[in-house]
């Protein structure tokens, strides 16, 4: 699987999850998030050669098409597969609130 | 929606579904498919600027990050959203068989 366990341990050029740290205030302008100050959102990147973690029949077909037609511009793209939530602390005035934000952290990628 | 109705009628540079005809024999080397000879598989391509048909909170966050950090290499990618099946006719010996192949035709795209 093209997950953090594999991708963070290997120098993988093809589609894989890459580490990306986002600082809420500096990178997003979100002053309202109190904790954490930032988090590893990660992202997916890298070429999608034929059959690499293909998501659907279409991405398999497109990968094969691309292999047999190297000049073609149509190819699958490396995108998130599994995402996890992030728990944050913010304040409503002086009152602390805890919220779970869904689909914030990429754990693995696929060719789609 | 970034679907065929919209994308095929507009000269859209950003993420959109594009027409792609695949000939089973010539483009894939699939001699076993009798009918159709080919089909419009289509594909997704084009930049994913901030907030364009974002798929998840992560892709929205990544788009926002990319907007505020233009030098960043991390950005969402244009991939299939809705896919449709394709019905094909093939032969097992002299016996015709009809099969529905799932997820063969891209109908719309998203930024993921």
């Amino acid at each position: 699987a093209l997950d953090t366990n594999y991708c963070f341990r290997n120098l993988e050029e093809n589609c894989c999850v890459r580490p990306l740290y986002i600082d809420f205030r500096q990178d997003l302008g979100w002053k309202w998030v109190h904790e954490p100050k930032g988090y590893y959102a990660n992202f997916c990147s890298g070429p999608c050669p034929y059959l690499r973690s293909a998501d659907t029949t279409h991405s398999t077909v497109l990968g094969l098409y691309n292999t047999l037609n190297p000049e073609a511009s149509a190819s699958p793209c490396c995108v998130p597969q599994d995402l996890e939530p992030l728990t944050i602390l913010y304040y409503v005035g002086r009152t602390p609130k805890v919220e779970q934000l869904s689909n914030m952290v990429v754990k693995s990628c696929k060719c789609s | 929606a970034l679907d065929t109705n919209y994308c095929f009628r507009n000269l859209e540079e950003n993420c959109c579904v594009r027409p792609l005809y695949i000939d089973f024999r010539q483009d894939l080397g699939w001699k076993w498919v009798h009918e159709p000879k080919g089909y419009y598989a289509n594909f997704c391509s084009g930049p994913c600027p901030y907030l364009r048909s974002a798929d998840t909170t992560h892709s929205t966050v990544l788009g926002l990050y990319n907007t505020l950090n233009p030098e960043a290499s991390a950005s969402p990618c244009c991939v299939p959203q809705d896919l449709e099946p394709l019905t094909i006719l093939y032969y097992v010996g002299r016996t015709p068989k009809v099969e529905q192949l799932s997820n063969m035709v891209v109908k719309s795209c998203k930024c993921s």
């Epitope: 997003l28 302008g29 913010y90 304040y91 | 909170t57 929205t60």
Partner: antibody, heavy 120, light 108 residues
Framework: QVQLVQSGAEVKKPGSSVKVSCKAS????????ISWVRQAPGKGLQWVGG????????NYAQRFKGRVTLTADTSTNTVYMELSNLRTEDTAVYYC?????????????WGQGTLVTVSS | ETVLTQSPGTLSLSPGERATLSCRAS???????LAWYQQKPGQAPRLLIY???SRAPGVPARFSGSGSGTDFTLTISSLEPEDFAVYYC?????????FGQGTKLEIK
């Protein structure tokens, strides 16, 4: 420059609903919280609630809970306020306003206001 | 909820004079959860002061805010003709946000 442009005036019957829009431009929409404040004719200001774009976290004044829904459409940089089960005392000018950054905060830019009239 | 009481209800002064507007909270707001706004007829409120004493961008230096706890003051050092309006204080320490009933500053 920062602008908040609201939808036009509405006349509604008691018991019905109204949805007011507020389109933001001139700044990074998803970086700021949007609050809604109303002002009855000749009266003071009353906070309705606020919403955080992207994550759609909304906070409401207790008196409006269950009747008001605040949502943000990040694809169009637009925030919506829907108020249901309208009463005549809901007749007011409704303003959207950008906060300085926190969920509860001072508000530095305001929309032009939308007059909602509730009358039978 | 936190009740804000503004005084006086109406203040009659002449251009060039000093205006002092008061805002009292029913419970302590600390030192940084109070804002002041100016509103003219038919217009949206305009932010003047936030954090009790910080001037918003573009606000003239004649406007100043002070105070902490339960007592806050907006001072206009020398009134200009365009300053005659209604002034509201707002607290954002606790939900719900609340506003004072307003002080009308009118020309004497």
């Amino acid at each position: 420059q920062v602008q908040l442009v609201q939808s036009g005036a509405e006349v509604k019957k008691p018991g019905s609903s109204v949805k007011v829009s507020c389109k933001a431009s001139g700044y990074t929409f998803s970086s700021n919280v949007i609050s809604w404040v109303r002002q009855a004719p000749g009266k003071g200001l009353q906070w309705v609630g606020g919403v955080i774009p992207i994550v759609d976290i909304a906070n409401y004044a207790q008196r409006f809970k269950g009747r008001v829904t605040l949502t943000a459409d990040t694809s169009t940089n637009t925030v919506y306020m829907e108020l249901s089960n309208l009463r005549t005392e809901d007749t007011a000018v409704y303003y959207c306003a950008r906060t300085l950054g926190l969920v509860l905060d001072a508000m530095d830019y305001w929309g032009q206001g939308t007059l909602v009239t509730v009358s039978s | 909820e936190t009740v804000l009481t503004q005084s006086p209800g109406t203040l009659s002064l002449s251009p060039g004079e000093r205006a002092t507007l008061s805002c009292r909270a029913s419970q302590s707001l600390g030192s940084s959860y109070l804002a002041w706004y100016q509103q003219k007829p038919g217009q949206a409120p305009r932010l003047l002061i936030y954090g009790a004493s910080s001037r918003a961008p573009g606000v003239p230096a004649r406007f100043s805010g002070s105070g902490s706890g339960t007592d806050f003051t907006l001072t206009i050092s020398s009134l200009e003709p365009e300053d005659f309006a209604v002034y509201y204080c707002q607290q954002y320490a606790d939900s719900p946000i609340t506003f004072g009933q307003g002080t009308k500053l009118e020309i004497k």
